[in-house]
């Protein structure tokens, strides 16, 4: 008969035979034969394989290097890689999170739209009319100008995106 040219899911073709792939968490030691099943062995400590595979070596777990501002978010298993994240105040430079940078601060005139996480930087937005920010901050949002009217005061100095309004007493000489 014709040897197989394709195999079922979780199998692979070798020497005209369909062999079982090794399950996640195990590596290939020897291919199946006509009379024997594929031989697989569990990955060692600090190793993993996350798919059905025919790999002869397991992958090393990612190292979360504290010198790069990294720490372990989720410990790896024989079937999953370690997930790194950044120390407080830092965020990843890429999706793979191989290094960290300090969270960006929003300059005066800008406020925090979205606070940074371990994997995303601060998102700043310009303070719209009626709002201001007079500090460089990674946490402060734009604050609304003070409402002089509610304090029975009048605006003595208009506010900007960087400064609050200055309120003062009403002019009592005015009719």
């Amino acid at each position: 008969p014709e040897p197989p040219t394709a195999c079922r899911e979780k199998q692979y073709l070798i020497n005209s035979q369909c062999c079982s792939l090794c399950q996640p968490g195990q590596k290939l030691v020897s291919d199946c034969t006509e009379f024997t099943e594929t031989e697989c062995l569990p990955c060692g400590e600090s190793e993993f394989l996350d798919t059905w595979n025919r790999e002869t070596h397991c992958h090393q777990h990612k190292y979360c290097d504290p010198n790069l501002g990294l720490r372990v978010q989720q410990k790896g298993t024989s079937e999953t890689d370690t997930i790194c994240t950044c120390e407080e105040g830092w965020h990843c430079t890429s999706e793979a999170c191989e290094s960290c940078v300090l969270h960006r601060s929003c300059s005066p005139g800008f406020g925090v739209k979205q606070i940074a996480t371990g994997v995303s930087d601060t998102i700043c937005e310009p303070c719209p009319v009626g709002f201001f920010s007079n500090v460089s901050s990674a946490f402060e949002k734009c604050h609304p100008w003070t409402s002089c009217e509610t304090k029975d005061l009048v605006v003595q100095q208009a506010g900007t995106n960087k400064t609050d309004v200055v309120c003062g007493p009403q002019d009592r000489l005015r009719a």
Epitope: P1, C32, T33, F35, T36, E37, E39
Partner: antibody, heavy 123, light 107 residues
């Protein structure tokens, strides 16, 4: 009932030939690998060879001690296995068993055996 | 070829005894190890395949264990019908090879 019955054994001179037969019943003969195993008087078991099933093209494998001298064949229409033995030697003297070879990749084994037929090679 | 060494070659035991037969392969056979029982003048009979799986109809007093190169057949409580010769056989690599046999005799 699953059964294997050998025949054809006897006395033969060194250098001579003999053909053994094994009649199978009680199972779908063409689905199985079939084997010959021999046992010299008072000794252990020795695998001689096998013939694969229909799905695997009825190809054969032999032990080094008989390769080129012995031929295994089968007639699936008659449910019969054969062992053609040529250039026989004194050391081929043994009881010859026909055996069904079964199993999966989680382990193959000789699960059905015939009663055996004695082959004596002597002058 | 893979050599199969059985020990002991013979043993004497009484009915009710626990009997252990060992089989050592010359290389790792990954549990592809079968056991057969043979009585005088009869054909061998399959007892256990793939190290520990009993063939249908085989009494539970027969059990197999082992891994790598070392395997064991145990008869937990020897019965009169168990006096016979026992052979191991590796099914990992051609040519299939058998152990030399262990003859279990009545003490």
């Amino acid at each position: 009932e699953v059964q294997l019955v050998e025949s054809g054994g006897g006395l033969v001179q060194p250098g001579g030939s003999l053909r053994l037969s094994c009649a199978a019943s009680g199972f779908t003969f063409s689905d199985y690998y079939m084997s010959w195993v021999r046992q010299a008087p008072g000794k252990g078991l020795e695998w001689v060879g096998f013939i694969r099933n229909k799905a695997n093209g009825y190809t054969t494998e032999y032990a080094a001690s008989v390769k080129g001298r012995f031929t295994i064949s089968r007639d699936n229409s008659k449910n019969t296995l054969y062992l053609q033995m040529n250039s026989l030697r004194a050391e081929d003297t043994a009881v010859y068993y026909c055996a069904r070879y079964g199993g999966l990749r989680q382990g193959w084994y000789f699960d059905v055996w015939g009663q055996g037929t004695l082959v004596t090679v002597s002058s | 070829d893979i050599q199969m060494t059985q020990s002991p070659s013979s043993l004497s035991a009484s009915v009710g005894d626990r009997v252990t037969i060992t089989c050592r392969a010359s290389q790792d056979i990954r549990n592809y190890l079968n056991w057969y029982q043979q009585k005088p003048g009869k054909a061998p009979k399959l007892l256990i395949y793939y190290t520990s799986r009993r063939d249908s109809g085989v009494p539970s007093r027969f059990s197999g264990s082992g891994s790598g190169t070392d395997y064991t057949l145990t008869i937990s409580s020897l019965q009169p019908e168990d006096f016979a010769t026992y052979f191991c056989q590796q099914g990992k690599t051609l040519p299939w090879t058998f152990g030399g046999g262990t003859k279990v005799e009545i003490k």
